[in-house]
Structures are given as structure tokens and as C-alpha cells.
Interface confidence: low
């Protein structure tokens, strides 16, 4: 007579999470009598999948009437896939008896499930770092499954290459994880500036999750300090301005001292953005010129985000003439306050 | 306010070069300095930056190929392993005070011939 | 990396008439883009910057416009001082780049 054969046509099945798996399986002859048995896993640890003369599969049914008279159809179908549910099927055919002993087996059907990673979760550093500092961004997505992912990284929608990218595990899993790390250099431009991470998956279909970060999170663009002495008023007071410009945040402290006593403190407040997103600041003081006998020591001292104070100083000459005191003249300092073209 | 190259000379192949190039009138700590050359007859190419910093980056062309290191008022740039390809005029060129932008100050450019 | 391709690679102009020198850069750049004029055996001169903006002391017959990936450069009113090489050069950022300048555009004047 013909050799019984357990057909499991299906080497393998690719469901996305959340949809219905078919697993097909046929026998060639009704005899011997027997019933059909589904497990996860061969071996001794296998799981008992379904079984059609006892126990309870709420979620697994069968595709053809296993009670019709001649049925040689014992494909099955699993509903509300999920990761937990990849592994290799297998179909046994059992000779009936007491108990049933364990036939054939079909080839197996190995069962793989498509899970969406999740939406990719950046991350940037903890503190603000300066231009031409080195800063690290990490993205993490979890959840996906097959392994295969690709991840990429943009600055301004310019490709980063200094990124590191793990999956995990390394070995098989119903489901992964990828953590990257980018490092970006920063440049004074950055304060609108933005890393998006991107993650491209099979599951995706082509239209790939995104996470972004700001980098005005992570920058911080030190003030450029300027103190001038415009022209000698009439009443004897001399009009000395500060300018704090290209800082960002815009958490700036100022504070005035004359002769080395605080004079004045102002905090800066809804300020006007530049084109590059970083702020300009002027703090005038008017000095009573008639009301000192020495030349007066004006201190302009700026604390920017919680960083130790910069001080710019000026002296305004009691003994020269006042009317004769040019207007706009520049404090002295220890470099350059000029900038090329910005 | 400029600056201006000097070292370039004849060389052989393979004999290493440093071309440097002085700033007058601003100071190197406010501003990023720049390396760019010119072979005879051909475009502008640009090379490397050197950060106020110090840090120094360089297009994926030269990388190896030069280095970029400052003093307070001088920036040099080693070629280190010239070839006839490098044959070119070299421009130095300040560029924005922290970071990279444009340039609005160059030198007069140094000649730099590579030959057997 | 940003790519930045000049087009034409010559164009030739008569006194008084129009030159209009395109660069189109392979990413978005934002207006973060320089124009520089170079006459033969002299070193460049920025001419525009932000795409638009005119450097001291450079005539306003030079115009520039565009942002994102594609910009201009117009020079009415040709003379013939006008005549050398003009580049384009992005002044977006530098990792990864092969060169921040376009290939160049040579004018001439008749």
C-alpha cells in the first residue's frame, strides 16, 4: 500500500504583526486512522498547538470541516499574530490507539512575523556643548521583526557618517532592537539646525519612521561683548552702551559696575531673533561725569547660561575735556570684537 | 586686516612641503582659517579649516594627504607626500569667527610646483 | 555630501548687456551660499553672500538670488572689468564634502 505522506507545501510564511497565518497541511491517504496534531518546536519541549479532539485554541482554527466524511485538509489558521507567535509549525499525523502513537511528520513551516519597529525615540546630550564641539544623538526603535532594518541619520537633510548602529540580539528573537549613536560636530549655524534619525523596515513599506531632535537643545554660542562711549551730553553725562551679540540661549545675565560696584543687574528678556536664531542684546548706563573726581572704571559683566561671567571694561576719562570726547569710542580689549561679514 | 602665503617652492615627489601663511590686523583665536588651492587653468578646490580651537577638518579628498596646524599668528599646511597632482597655487583664506561660512580675506597665493 | 554644479562653464557678454550664471547644489542649503569673482592671476573676491546679500564695496549690478538648491548670479550693465571666472560656494557645512565650490563659470566680454 501507499506510504502515508504529510504534505506541508509552505517552508516558510511571513504574517505582519496583528494578521490571521495560514499554515497548510494535507495527508495523501486516510489510512490508518489517526487524528492530526499542530505543535510549535520538534523535540520533547515541543508546544501542542492544536488539536482538534481536546483542549482549547481560542485563537487557532481550522480552514477545512475536520469532522467531514473524507477530509484530508488540516490546515489551520492563527489569528491576532503576534512576534511571540514566530517559530517553526509542524503537522503529525498519529495511528490511533491507547495511547495514539505518533506517525509522520510534515517538513515543518517555519512561521516568521513582520513587526513594525516603534517610532524611533532621539536623544541628544545632557548639557549644552559650543561650536566645534563633538556632541552625541542616540535613536532607539524597538519591537520590529524580520532583523533586516536600516537606519540613517540626517543633519539638516545632509547624511551623517559618523554613526554607530547595534541590533539586538545578535541571535535569533521573535523580536529586535537597534540603538545609534551620531556624532555631530556642532557649527554657530546649529541653533535651528535639526538630526532626524530615520528607520526603513520591510514592514514599512517604503515610508520610513522618523524621530528628530533639535539642536537648539544642545548648543550654546557664547556672547560677543562690545562696550563704546558715545558722544559727551550737554548735562555732563556720558552715554556708555554694551552690546551682547550672537549668544544663544537667550538666559543672559548683565550687570554694570562702576568702579568695581554693582551698578545696575538686567536679565534679558523676549528678544528679537537673528537670521541664525542666535540674539543680540544693548544695555545703556548714563554716567554723571561732574559727580567723580577720577576717571570712572566701567565694567560691563555678562553671565550667559549658567557659564562663569565675561567681563568687558572701559574707562571714561573725568580729566579730558567732555566735549572734546569723540563719540563711538571703542573699549579696549584683549581681541578683536569685529566680524567679517555677519 | 590680510594674510599671505609663503613656502612655495619646487619639489620633487614624495619630499614634503609646508607652506604657512601670516595674519595681520585679527587675531587667529576669533577667527577659522582656511586652505584652498588652485591647479593651473582649473577651479577653486577647497582643502581644510582650522577651528579657533584648534580642531581641524579637511575634504574627503585631502584627508592624509595635508595637515593643518596653527601657531598664534601663522597657519601651516604640510602637504605630506607631494605628487605632480598637487602642482597648484595655494590660498589661505580667514573664514568666519567660530565656525565655517565664507571667506572675505585672501592671500596673494603661494606657487606650488611638483616635478621630477 | 553637497555637490555644487555651476552652469555655464563659459558664457561670453557685450558691454552693457545682462549675465546670468546659475549653481545648483545637490542638497537643500538653506541661503547659505557665496559668490566670488576671480580675475586671472589674482586671488577670489567675494562678491555676494547668503545667497543675496552684496559684500562691501561691490557694485549693486551684481544680484544674487535663489534658496534651497538652486541660485543665480546676475551682472546688468556688463563692462568689461567684469570679465574673469565666478564661483559658487556653499557655506553650509563641511563634513563630508569634496569641495564647497562650484566647477566655476568663465565670462567674456566683447
Known amino acids: 500500500e501507499e506510504e502515508l505522506q504529510v504534505i506541508q507545501p509552505e517552508k516558510s510564511v511571513s504574517v505582519a504583526a496583528g494578521d490571521s497565518a495560514t499554515l497548510n497541511c494535507t495527508v495523501s491517504s486516510l489510512i490508518p486512522v489517526g487524528p492530526i496534531q499542530w505543535f510549535r518546536g520538534a523535540g520533547p519541549g515541543r508546544e501542542l498547538i492544536y488539536n482538534l479532539k481536546e483542549g482549547h485554541f481560542p485563537r487557532v482554527t481550522p480552514v477545512s470541516d475536520p469532522t467531514k466524511r473524507n477530509n484530508m485538509d488540516f490546515s489551520i489558521r492563527i489569528s491576532n499574530i503576534t512576534p511571540a507567535d514566530a517559530g517553526t509549525y509542524y503537522c503529525v499525523k498519529f495511528r490511533k490507539g491507547s495511547p495514539d502513537v505518533e506517525l509522520k511528520s510534515g517538513a515543518g513551516t517555519e512561521l516568521s512575523v513582520r513587526a513594525k519597529p516603534s517610532a524611533p525615540v532621539v536623544s541628544g546630550p545632557a548639557v549644552r556643548a559650543t561650536a566645534e564641539h563633538t556632541v552625541s544623538f542616540t535613536c532607539e526603535s524597538h519591537g520590529f521583526s524580520p532583523r533586516d532594518i536600516t537606519l540613517k541619520w540626517f543633519k539638516n537633510g545632509n547624511e551623517l557618517s559618523d554613526v554607530q548602529t547595534n541590533v539586538d540580539p545578535a541571535g535569533k528573537s521573535v523580536s529586535y532592537s537597534i540603538r545609534s549613536t551620531a556624532r555631530v560636530v556642532l557649527t554657530r549655524r546649529d541653533v535651528h539646525s535639526q538630526v532626524i534619525c530615520e528607520v526603513a523596515h520591510v514592514t514599512l513599506q517604503g515610508d520610513p519612521l522618523r524621530g528628530t531632535a533639535n539642536l537648539s537643545e544642545a548648543i550654546r554660542v557664547p556672547p560677543f561683548l562690545e562696550v563704546t562711549q558715545q558722544s559727551m551730553r550737554a548735562d555732563n553725562q556720558v552715554n556708555v552702551t554694551c552690546q551682547v551679540t550672537k549668544f544663544y540661549p537667550q538666559r543672559l545675565q548683565l550687570t554694570w559696575l562702576e568702579n568695581g560696584n554693582v551698578s545696575r543687574t538686567e536679565m534679558a528678556s523676549a528678544l528679537p531673533e537673528n537670521k541664525d536664531g542666535t540674539y543680540n542684546w544693548t544695555s545703556w548706563l548714563l554716567v554723571n561725569v561732574s559727580a567723580h573726581r577720577d576717571d570712572v572704571k566701567l565694567t560691563c559683566q555678562v553671565e550667559h547660561d549658567g557659564q562663569p561671567a565675561v567681563n568687558k571694561s572701559f574707562s571714561v576719562k573725568v580729566s579730558a575735556h567732555p566735549k572734546e570726547q569723540g563719540s563711538n569710542t571703542a573699549a579696549e580689549n584683549t581681541g578683536t570684537n569685529e566680524r567679517n561679514i555677519y | 586686516q590680510s594674510v599671505e602665503e609663503s613656502g612655495g617652492r619646487l619639489v620633487t615627489p614624495g619630499t614634503p612641503l609646508t607652506l604657512t601663511c601670516t595674519v595681520s590686523?585679527?587675531?587667529?583665536?576669533?577667527?577659522?582659517m582656511h586652505w584652498v588651492r588652485q591647479a593651473p587653468g582649473k577651479g577653486l578646490e577647497w582643502i581644510g579649516i582650522?577651528?579657533?580651537?584648534?580642531a581641524t577638518s579637511y575634504a574627503t579628498w585631502a584627508k592624509g594627504q595635508f595637515t593643518i596646524s596653527k601657531t598664534s599668528t601663522t597657519v601651516d599646511l604640510k602637504i605630506t607626500s607631494p605628487t605632480t597632482e598637487d602642482t597648484a597655487t595655494y590660498f589661505c583664506a580667514r573664514g568666519d569667527r567660530d565656525g565655517y561660512a565664507y571667506f572675505n580675506i585672501w592671500g596673494p597665493g603661494t606657487l606650488v610646483t611638483v616635478s621630477l | 555630501q553637497i555637490v555644487m554644479t555651476q552652469t555655464p562653464f563659459s558664457v561670453s557678454a557685450v558691454v552693457g548687456g545682462t549675465v546670468t550664471i546659475k549653481c545648483q547644489a545637490s542638497h537643500n542649503i538653506g541661503s547659505w551660499l557665496a559668490w566670488y569673482q576671480q580675475k586671472p592671476g589674482q586671488r577670489p573676491k567675494l562678491l555676494i553672500y547668503?545667497?543675496?546679500t552684496l559684500a562691501s564695496g561691490v557694485s549693486s549690478r551684481f544680484k544674487g538670488s535663489g534658496s534651497g538648491t538652486e541660485f543665480t548670479l546676475t551682472i546688468s550693465g556688463v563692462e568689461s572689468a567684469d570679465a574673469a571666472t565666478y564661483y559658487c560656494?556653499?557655506?553650509?557645512?563641511?563634513?563630508?564634502?569634496?569641495?564647497?565650490f562650484g566647477g566655476g563659470t568663465e565670462v567674456v566680454v566683447k
Open positions: 547668503d545667497a543675496s
Open positions: 560656494q556653499q557655506g553650509y557645512g563641511i563634513s563630508y564634502v569634496h569641495n564647497v
Open positions: 590686523g585679527f587675531s587667529l583665536s576669533n577667527y577659522a
Open positions: 582650522i577651528y579657533t580651537g584648534g
